[in-house]
């Protein structure tokens, strides 16, 4: 009766700071709402990054100061990280719940680990 | 730091109502579910209800299903248990705790005893 | 709901020595959603390992965990003076959230 979670072991960022995965559940009950939380684990310490909460059919809704996007699929949620920067690099993990109806229900993946690059300047041209 | 206090115990006749509080300080308390645990006199942790971000969902043990409300105002970072029909069995210390960010229970509060005695 | 057992009841050891708790579980638990507690007389509980075998922050490396499915086990390597507590093990990946009824490890 555990949920599991899958997602990619490792993404690269593209130039613009801009990275994307899925995260997909096996959903043990027939969930109408459901919780998606991004988090990011550096050392031992675990942070949140982002978090929505969304009606199965409908669209994911993060605040509007977030730096998560969403759209959700079945049991499939495609996430996206904007603004990342090089020292944004690590293990990004993504943890599902079904809030309702009962019971709750909770799955964390193994982690995506994300790599950001800064782009190299560019060089004065004379 | 991170801190939870309880408070509202007492010694309470069967039948009647009891509210505990739970006052929490130093994390963003919106950001995390929110649970009541309690432990009778010599026995072991019982889990009794949890509180969901923003409050719209909760969830209770069977043994205090529709006795007990589990409330939260996030504006005030404070979490409460309001105990209704008490019974003699519901003696224990009451503690609250928060749900950690990867599930398990990582901040407790010092806990709050609850004695229902005619 | 998932039911908890813990063995033994009461744990009787020295200082110095390795103490083996064991929790088995009802149903299959992930092994990602199983952790263990310690609480001493008149105190809160404190976590001490959460996913089965990740220490919690500031919990020394002596205490250890292990297991998957059905069967995990705490272990603690050499026993401290205040390593005699009352341990419990819970799983919290559905609810209802269920502890198992406890481990007393007592000094012999």
């Known amino acids: 009766k555990a949920m599991h979670v899958a997602q990619p072991a490792v993404v690269l960022a593209n130039s613009r700071g801009t990275a994307s995965f899925v995260c997909e559940y096996a959903s043990p009950g027939k969930a109408t709402e459901v919780r998606v939380t991004v988090l990011r684990q550096a050392d031992s310490q675990v942070t949140e990054v982002c978090a929505a909460t969304y009606m199965m059919g409908n669209e994911l809704t993060f605040l509007d100061d977030s730096i998560c996007t969403g759209t959700s699929s079945g049991n499939q949620v495609n996430l996206t990280i904007q603004g990342l920067r090089a020292m944004d690099t690590g293990l990004y993990i993504c943890k599902v719940e079904l809030m309702y109806p009962p019971p709750y229900y909770m799955g964390i993946g193994n982690g995506t680990q994300i790599y950001v690059i800064d782009p190299e300047p560019c060089p004065d041209s004379d | 730091q991170v801190q939870l206090v309880e408070s509202g115990g007492g010694v309470v006749q069967p039948g009647r109502s009891l509210r505990l509080s739970c006052a929490a300080s130093g994390f963003t308390f919106r950001s995390y579910g929110m649970h009541w645990v309690r432990q009778a006199p010599g026995k072991g942790l019982e889990w009794v209800a949890v509180?969901?971000?923003?409050?719209?969902?909760?969830h209770y043990a069977d043994s205090v299903k529709g006795r007990f409300t589990i409330s939260r105002d996030n504006s005030k970072n404070t979490l409460y248990l309001q105990m209704n029909s008490l019974r003699a069995e519901d003696t224990a210390v009451y503690y609250c705790?928060?749900?950690?960010?990867?599930?398990?229970?990582?901040?407790w509060g010092q806990g709050t005893m609850v004695t229902v005695s005619s | 709901e998932i039911v908890l057992t813990q063995s033994p009841g009461t744990l009787s050891l020295s200082p110095g020595e390795r103490a083996t708790l064991s929790c088995r579980a009802s149903?299959?638990?992930?092994?990602?959603?199983l952790a263990w507690y310690q609480q001493k007389p008149g105190q809160a509980p404190r976590l001490l390992i959460y996913g089965a075998s990740s220490r919690a922050t500031g919990i020394p490396d002596r205490f250890s965990g292990s297991g998957s499915g059905t069967d995990f086990t705490l272990t603690i390597s050499r026993l401290e003076p205040e390593d005699f507590a009352v341990y419990y093990c819970?799983?919290?990946?559905?609810?209802?959230?269920?502890f198992g009824p406890g481990t007393k490890v007592d000094i012999k």
């Open positions: 819970q799983q919290y990946g559905s609810s209802p959230f269920t």
């Open positions: 705790a928060r749900n950690g960010l990867i599930g398990a229970f990582d901040i």
């Open positions: 149903q299959s638990v992930s092994s990602s959603y």
């Open positions: 509180i969901w971000y923003d409050g719209s969902n909760k």
